[in-house]
């Protein structure tokens, strides 16, 4: 892209190059032949995050507790507020405008990845040799009990939802 008539951090208006306002400030009046661009800081609840010629600052995002949101990072004059979800909830979308409860992994499934404020629980089916008999947002698939190490034998085979049942070995005399 070839260079334009005005330099970086300038804008072209009415045949003159005016300085853009720095992040955190809004445009009050364009420069003239005799005066510089006039900018004013954004108020406490507002921000602008780029070099700009905006006449209004943007409102900080509101983290609505009724939607399960809380402030992760307070906004400044140059940055927007960052919201995250309350414990046990995660964002519904990338913009995180509201939160939903974490998914629980049903029996037969274990937690592969625990949910965060921005991502839901990831479940995986319990492979052979592992089981989960609870609906949980935290529990991984657990290995079947090893009857042999307890000097016991398998009386009932395990499934993806149940542990094996161990019993005493038949002692034949």
């Amino acid at each position: 892209e070839p260079p334009t008539a005005c330099r970086e951090k300038q804008y072209l208006i009415n045949s003159q190059c005016c300085s853009l306002c720095q992040p955190g400030q809004k445009l009050v009046s364009d420069c003239t032949e005799f005066t510089e661009t006039e900018c004013l800081p954004c108020s406490e609840s507002e921000f602008l995050d780029t070099w700009n010629r905006e006449t209004r600052c943007h409102q900080h995002k509101y983290c609505d507790p009724n939607l399960g949101l809380r402030v992760q990072q307070k906004g400044t004059s140059e940055t927007d507020t960052i919201c995250t979800c309350e414990e046990g909830l995660h964002c519904m979308s990338e913009s995180c405008e509201s939160c939903v409860p974490h998914r629980s992994c049903l029996p037969g499934f274990g937690v592969k990845q625990i949910a965060t404020g921005v991502s839901d629980t990831i479940c995986e089916p319990c492979p052979v040799g592992f089981f989960s008999n609870v609906s949980s947002a935290f529990e991984k698939c657990r290995p079947w009990t090893s009857c042999e190490t307890k000097d016991l034998v398998v009386q009932q085979a395990g499934t993806n939802k149940t542990d094996v049942v161990c019993g005493p070995q038949d002692r034949q005399r």
Partner: antibody
């Protein structure tokens, strides 16, 4: 006082190119943009483009940008407009003007006639 | 691109009259509107910039008003020297555009 002195009238053949000059005086040449405009006989004005003599950066009217080239020589305080692949539609008076809150000062115009 | 419409292409008035020329933009251009005078010999001068600011050396008989889309150039106490074509031009958004012009004649 601010003055913009343009080069003299040109008679050129279709398909060729023309280069119009605009010598500025009476102010700091690098501090103001130079605008170029076209006026066909008995018609209104049409903007061609703008150049920053300080940086050499420019903006063009999309309608003409493939054929127009704006340049500036700081050492002689002169701006140039070159127009290529000329047709009869390019027969017009071409003006340069100093920027700074509109086209604040204008050259006297250069008549370009495209004719076989 | 932004269109500028000068509805009156020619206007006849008497010396000493007050004359108003209008210019309408196809969209809001705030106050980025300039007025020019082109004499019969082709020379062009800036009269007002930013809708109402009188350019240096321009007689105070010339005044400008308007903002947004509707703009007016007023010449009070018309003089012989004011015989010319008057153009408006917007400096809000590239490409810069001009009105079609209003030719002022003496009755």
């Amino acid at each position: 006082q601010v003055q913009l002195q343009q080069s003299g009238a040109e008679l050129v053949r279709p398909g060729t190119s023309v280069k119009v000059s605009c010598k500025a005086s009476g102010y700091a040449f690098s501090d103001y943009l130079i605008e170029w405009a076209k006026q066909r006989p008995g018609q209104g004005l049409e903007w061609i483009g703008v150049i920053n003599p300080g940086s050499g950066g420019s903006n063009y009217n999309e309608k003409i940008k493939d054929r127009a080239t704006l340049t500036a020589d700081k050492s002689s305080s002169t701006a140039y407009m070159q127009l290529s692949s000329l047709t009869s539609e390019d027969s017009a008076v071409y003006f340069c003007a100093r920027g700074g809150g509109g086209f604040t000062y204008w050259g006297q115009g250069t008549l370009v006639t495209v004719s076989a | 691109e932004i269109q500028l419409t000068q509805t009156t292409s020619s206007l006849s008035a008497s010396l000493g009259d007050r004359v108003t020329i209008s210019c309408r933009a196809s969209q809001d251009i705030s106050n980025y509107l300039n007025w020019y005078q082109q004499k019969p010999d082709g020379t062009i001068k800036l009269l007002l910039n930013f809708a109402s600011r009188l350019h240096s050396g321009v007689p105070s008989r010339f005044s400008g008003s308007g903002s947004g889309t509707d703009f007016f150039l007023t010449i009070s106490n018309l003089e012989q020297d004011d015989i010319a074509t008057y153009f408006c031009q917007q400096g809000s958004t590239l490409p810069w555009t001009f009105g079609g012009g209003t030719k002022l004649e003496i009755k």
